[in-house]
Interface confidence: low
Amino acid sequence: APRGTQAEESPFVGNPGNITGARGLTGTLRCQLQVQGEPPEVHWLRDGQILELADSTQTQVPLGEDEQDDWIVVSQLRITSLQLSDTGQYQCLVFLGHQTFVSQPGYVGLEGLPYFLEEPEDRTVAANTPFNLSCQAQGPPEPVDLLWLQDAVPLATAPGHGPQRSLHVPGLNKTSSFSCEAHNAKGVTTSRTATITVLPQQPRNLHLVSRQPTELEVAWTPGLSGIYPLTHCTLQAVLSDDGMGIQAGEPDPPEEPLTSQASVPPHQLRLGSLHPHTPYHIRVACTSSQGPSSWTHWLPVETPEGVPLGPPENISATRNGSQAFVHWQEPRAPLQGTLLGYRLAYQGQDTPEVLMDIGLRQEVTLELQGDGSVSNLTVCVAAYTAAGDGPWSLPVPLEAWRPG
């Protein structure tokens, strides 16, 4: 036949077929053409658009020995894992001379069991606390109807009464499982089963019951814990830092907290071995067989001042006539607060005790009554804080002053 006439005819002798299947299916579309002369490159179209990155292979078989003889060309387009984006009308396209030829169309359709775009996730929730679960599925075929199951028992959500995709659970009192069934004309797909673990609610009203310099007694109100009794509560105390960190809302303390466990009830705990006159932050969480609640917010507390734990050190008292000179050093033992001053008491053998508040000085000159003939004078010194006096020193006898 003359070339001119031949060019008018479609060179395609095989057109793409139809593929309809479920997601993930692997399939191949084929085009076959017979041409005279040099075989052309076969392009694939989807819905009229050239596929630039098509996974296609082209096989060319000459039907004669001469270059100008006919060739059979087979182009195969492989669809490795069928997705919604693969669906549409497929055609082959070739440029021959000054003409463009397009094959008859083949169709790729997705039709199978529903496919989950989103499935319910495992999570923990506080007892009796509302939460939402999500599930989303698509076909085709559409429509896809969702059915929620709680502990394998179906729940219903009315059309137009809250989206099927989101299940609002007003609260749970026991650990439960949730899954979602997606129904379409092809059948049913079941999602993963999400375990919703019911933890105790965060305790409330953490407060101080009593304070001592090295001890704080605290109490709190437990939250609901569903059907699971609380096994214990855990209290953490941490030394407050420079005002950043915890107070700025950081979730974790800057250093290792002091942790104590309380049997419950009662929901109360005595925290000992604390530093006096020191700011702390405390928090509490309660635990059931299902796990711990969330921690309460950090509560700032402070131990009160205590009295100094020891007397002033190195007291010396010397006498010179009707005057006595007494000096001492700060107690080595912990002050348990802010040192406000010292008290001094002196007494003769047959005279009443004289008590003096010296303030923060560490020395004092005493004016003794009369000619200073009072015998066996002794001096005692104590340090004090806002909480009161520390222990008195042992009596120190006044020694006569020796010059030089």
């Epitope: 028992v153 179906p154 729940l155 219903a156 959500t157 009315a158 059309p159 009464h161 007003p170 129904h183 004309a185 059948g187 049913v188």
Partner: antibody, heavy 120, light 107 residues
């Protein structure tokens, strides 16, 4: 037109077995969930069992679990209820019902019923 | 098990009246309530599902309403053919449960 016809009822002694059938027509049977519901002489309705369109999921009333089996043969458009270890309290009119598209736990079409009497 | 309680076993009405039949669920059934009508010697017929959705072919004088635990079926302009038993049912979860029924009769 949706049509459901039950058969297989009768009078049996306690402990006996009976199989009810329900032939469906007028709709694509495999697209719908189906249920059995019974009505006692005091006019009370009691749900007995349900089955999904494909037959893969079944649900039962607690006091029939282990004694009754709901099944379906989609190729024959037929629903079944196999009842064994029958008790006098199973005496009732048994209805076959189609589940509505919007919720197959709501029943949009019912058969005329098949009577089951369990008596010694 | 969700218990459906129809507090009135009988309700008297006159032709042309408006009557409401009530049903109370023992827990929230999120509007998954159906209403059925049954006449003597006949099988039940679905009137309403999802609390307020009228089934195909049901006259619009039948209206369902309610949410949470309280539901009602209202028949406005009662006709003689409406004299029957009415049952509520929860289609929220298994076991599916019905109310004991309310008989609508003429005064």
């Amino acid at each position: 037109e949706v049509n459901l016809v039950e058969s297989g009822g009768g009078v049996v002694k306690p402990g006996a077995s009976l199989k009810l059938s329900c032939e469906a027509s007028g709709f694509t049977f495999s697209n719908y969930g189906m249920s059995w519901v019974r009505q006692t002489s005091d006019k009370r309705l009691e749900w007995v069992a349900s089955i999904s369109g494909g037959g893969g999921r079944t649900y039962y009333l607690d006091n029939v679990k282990g004694r009754f089996i709901i099944s379906r043969e989609n190729a024959k458009n037929t629903l079944y209820l196999q009842m064994s270890s029958l008790k006098s309290e199973d005496t009732a009119l048994f209805y076959c019902a189609r589940g509505a598209r919007a919720s197959y736990f709501a029943m949009d079409y019912w058969g005329q019923g098949s009577s089951v009497t369990v008596s010694s | 098990v969700i218990v459906m309680t129809q507090s009135h076993k009988f309700m008297s009405t006159s032709v042309g009246d408006r009557v409401s039949i009530t049903c109370k669920a023992s827990q929230d059934v999120t509007t998954a309530v159906a209403w059925y009508q049954q006449k003597p010697g006949q099988s039940p017929k679905l009137l309403i599902y999802w609390a307020s959705t009228r089934h195909t072919g049901v006259p619009d004088r039948f209206t369902g309403s309610g949410s949470g635990t309280d539901y009602s079926l209202t028949i406005s302009n009662v006709q003689t053919e409406d004299l029957a038993f009415y049952y509520c049912q929860q289609h929220f979860t298994t076991p599916l449960t019905f109310g004991a029924g309310t008989k609508l009769e003429l005064k």
